[in-house]
């Protein structure tokens, strides 16, 4: 989790003077509880935006809007810390806004933004605004949380992003997996513009069950300049066990800017169809 | 134009299913997030279920959870909600609604629906 163009950040508007600063996420009213505390946030919004950095790089960022209630508890609202926790690794960030100058009620509902937060694809996130000073140890809270999950680089919109382009997103290899005779199939797959080696894995199932019945790795070296963009065909020999007869292929790549954590693609050939069997024709017809 | 247009809803009996689908033209649908929320007569909306871009991640409303399924085809710009098991407190008329920006909350909307059909009545009743 991180922060993006650290140095642009901005939360004054007028009427409010307004600083952001790192933030602990332990906000000093937790230890020195205040008698009077401001109400909630109203109406948190989570929309993912797309930000470019100054090298030009494209990052998805959470954009974290919401607004205030409309009663006297404004007046003893200092600021507000906004924390995004990762879910799957328990990382939290946290950023303060610092109130300056006191609020006053205006003609139009106060409306707070913020878009620097660096977003992962397909990752969740827990997000949060907490107003401070936060309450009292028995108070009513004052915060309100979404949890917010970032598309995968297969999104179309994601796909362009810099860390969905590092572990190789713009690459569609395209796979066929033909069945040939003889317990082979036939894998065929678009190169992508860079030298480098790929590995196929094959992981065979039989019908309707999850468990593998035949797994087989397949090493392919890294094409030449030449033969960037074409099609590479691997022919895979198969265990000979019946019933063994869904299979799973998936291409790892490993491009340079993602190493052995490139995305990998993946084609599935069902088993085949089974014929109903027909009553069995006796050998010979009675004639009684 | 931009539209969600829902249908399947009637009149059924407690216990039994219905199906309801939204057909959706005018935008990217596979690149968003969509919702099916209700409204029971006299009383205000009430988010049944959502479902990411890609249906990797679905929720429910607890009222719901084990009795309702939400399903998308995104190659039919289509959202689907397969209702068993329904009781006379599930009648309501049912709203598809699309997600406003990208991405996915768990509980309900991340930034408030942007889109939203005409609606389809269901009523159980015996």
């Known amino acids: 989790l991180r922060l993006l163009d650290h140095r642009a950040l901005v939360c004054s508007q007028p009427g409010l003077n307004c600083t952001v600063k790192n933030s602990t996420c332990l906000d000093d009213s937790w230890i020195h509880p205040r008698n009077l505390t401001p109400s909630s946030p109203k109406d948190l919004q989570i929309q993912l935006h797309f930000a470019h950095t100054q090298q030009g790089d494209l990052f998805p960022v959470a954009h974290i809007e919401w607004t205030l209630q409309t009663d006297a508890s404004i007046l003893y609202l200092e600021g507000a810390e906004l924390s995004v926790l990762q879910l799957n690794t328990n990382e939290r960030l946290c950023v303060r806004f610092e109130f300056l100058s006191k609020l006053r009620h205006h003609h139009r509902r106060w409306r707070f933004t913020f878009s620097h937060f660096v977003v992962d694809p397909d990752q969740e996130y827990e997000v949060t605004v907490h107003h401070l000073p936060k309450p009292i140890p028995d108070g009513d809270p004052n915060h309100q949380s979404k949890n917010f999950l970032v598309p995968d680089c297969e999104h179309a919109r994601m796909k362009v992003t810099t860390p969905c382009m590092s572990s190789g997103s713009l690459w569609d290899p395209n796979i066929t997996v033909e069945t040939l005779e003889a317990h082979q199939l036939r894998v065929s797959f678009t190169l992508w513009n860079e030298s480098t080696h790929y590995q196929i894995l094959l992981t065979s199932f039989p019908h309707m069950e999850n468990h593998s019945c035949f797994e087989h790795m397949h090493h392919i070296p890294a094409p030449r300049p030449e033969e960037f963009h074409q099609r590479s065909n691997v022919t895979l020999t198969l265990r000979n066990l019946k019933g063994c007869c869904r299979h799973q292929v998936q291409i790892q790549p490993f491009f340079s800017s993602c190493l052995n954590d490139c995305l990998r693609h993946s084609a599935t050939v069902s088993c085949p169809e089974m014929p109903d069997t027909p009553e069995p024709i006796p050998d010979y017809m009675p004639l009684w | 134009q931009v539209q969600l247009v829902e249908s399947g809803g009637g009149l059924v009996q407690p216990g039994r299913s219905l199906r309801l689908s939204c057909a959706a033209s005018?935008?990217?649908?596979?690149?968003?997030?969509m919702h099916w929320v209700r409204q029971a007569p006299g009383k205000g909306l009430e988010w049944v279920s959502g479902?990411?871009?890609?249906?990797?991640?679905?929720d429910y409303a607890d009222s719901v959870k084990g009795r309702f399924s939400i399903s998308r085809d995104n190659a039919k710009n289509s959202l689907y909600l397969q209702m068993n098991s329904l009781r006379p407190e599930d009648t309501a008329l049912y709203y598809c609604?699309?997600?406003?920006?990208?991405?996915?909350?768990?509980?309900?909307?991340?930034?408030?629906?942007?889109?939203w059909g005409q609606g389809t009545m269901v009523t159980v009743s015996s």
């Open positions: 609604a699309k997600e406003k920006s990208l991405g996915f909350c768990r509980g309900g909307s991340c930034s408030g629906f942007d889109i």
């Open positions: 005018g935008f990217t649908f596979d690149d968003y997030a």
């Open positions: 479902i990411s871009w890609n249906s990797g991640s679905i």
